[in-house]
């Protein structure tokens, strides 16, 4: 079999509040009931895990309480939101999808979404 295809947008600009959202879509070769989604950040060949969630098809994604990620799922599509981003967090955010159950296991890795984060300028002091 070929690698499971995972599609995600090439570029996303974070909002002024440091929030970025993007869709991660995977072409499921089978009828998975349990899916694991991991967001990885790649910068200068260093890769770190940003967040991860396992969900049952038809149910909500559940990230850890202290996660900077939230998300919803619809069919083979996952809508991911990352918050608390700052300029130093600019990088390539890669969606990794694993079909955990039932067997066989499948793994697909997206080509990444380049998220640009621009720290807002501080508001100038007002005379009023």
């Amino acid at each position: 079999c070929k690698a499971m295809h995972v599609a995600q947008p090439a570029v996303v600009l974070a909002s002024s509040r440091g929030i970025a959202s993007f869709v991660c879509e995977y072409a499921s070769p089978g009828k998975a009931t349990e899916v694991r989604v991991t967001v990885l950040r790649q910068a200068d060949s260093q890769v770190t895990e940003v967040c991860a969630a396992t969900y049952m098809m038809g149910n909500e994604l559940t990230f850890l309480d202290d996660s900077i990620c939230t998300g919803t799922s619809s069919g083979n599509q996952v809508n991911l939101t990352i918050q608390g981003l700052r300029a130093m967090d600019t990088g390539l955010y890669i969606c990794k999808v694993e079909l955990m159950y039932p067997p066989p296991y499948y793994l697909g890795i997206g080509n990444g979404t380049q998220i640009y984060v621009i720290d807002p300028e501080p508001c100038p002091d007002s005379d009023f």
Epitope: C1, K2, A3, S45, L107, G108, N111
Partner: nanobody, 126 residues
Framework: EVQLVESGGGLVQPGGSLRLSCAAS????????IGWFRQDPEKEREMVSC????????KYADSVKGRFTISRDNSKNTVYLQMNSLEAEDTAVYYC???????????????????WGQGTRVTVSS
Amino acid sequence: EVQLVESGGGLVQPGGSLRLSCAASGFSSDYYDIGWFRQDPEKEREMVSCIRSSGGSTKYADSVKGRFTISRDNSKNTVYLQMNSLEAEDTAVYYCGLAPISPVHAVCNQHYFGYWGQGTRVTVSS
């Protein structure tokens, strides 16, 4: 279905050599990273060595540099790990892993691996 089958493990004396083989099947992409990892009961699984299918970029753990050599035979979909000057600290179960990456992905990063073989045990002891 992706399958990775390791062979070549065994018992060897310190200073000896072994050659591990990993035969991959069920995966038709021309682009992937494939490598060797090891794990013993007290430790996390660690990457030993890895090679990229296209271009042949390689990576080695510091602890095995100069002693281990990874190579591949794309016609047989097989990757080899030649292990020389083996030490007691090399004792572990060795796993073959595959990462279905593309050119944008960092070479041989453990986060991208997900397909694993069953493992082959290497014991270095006198």
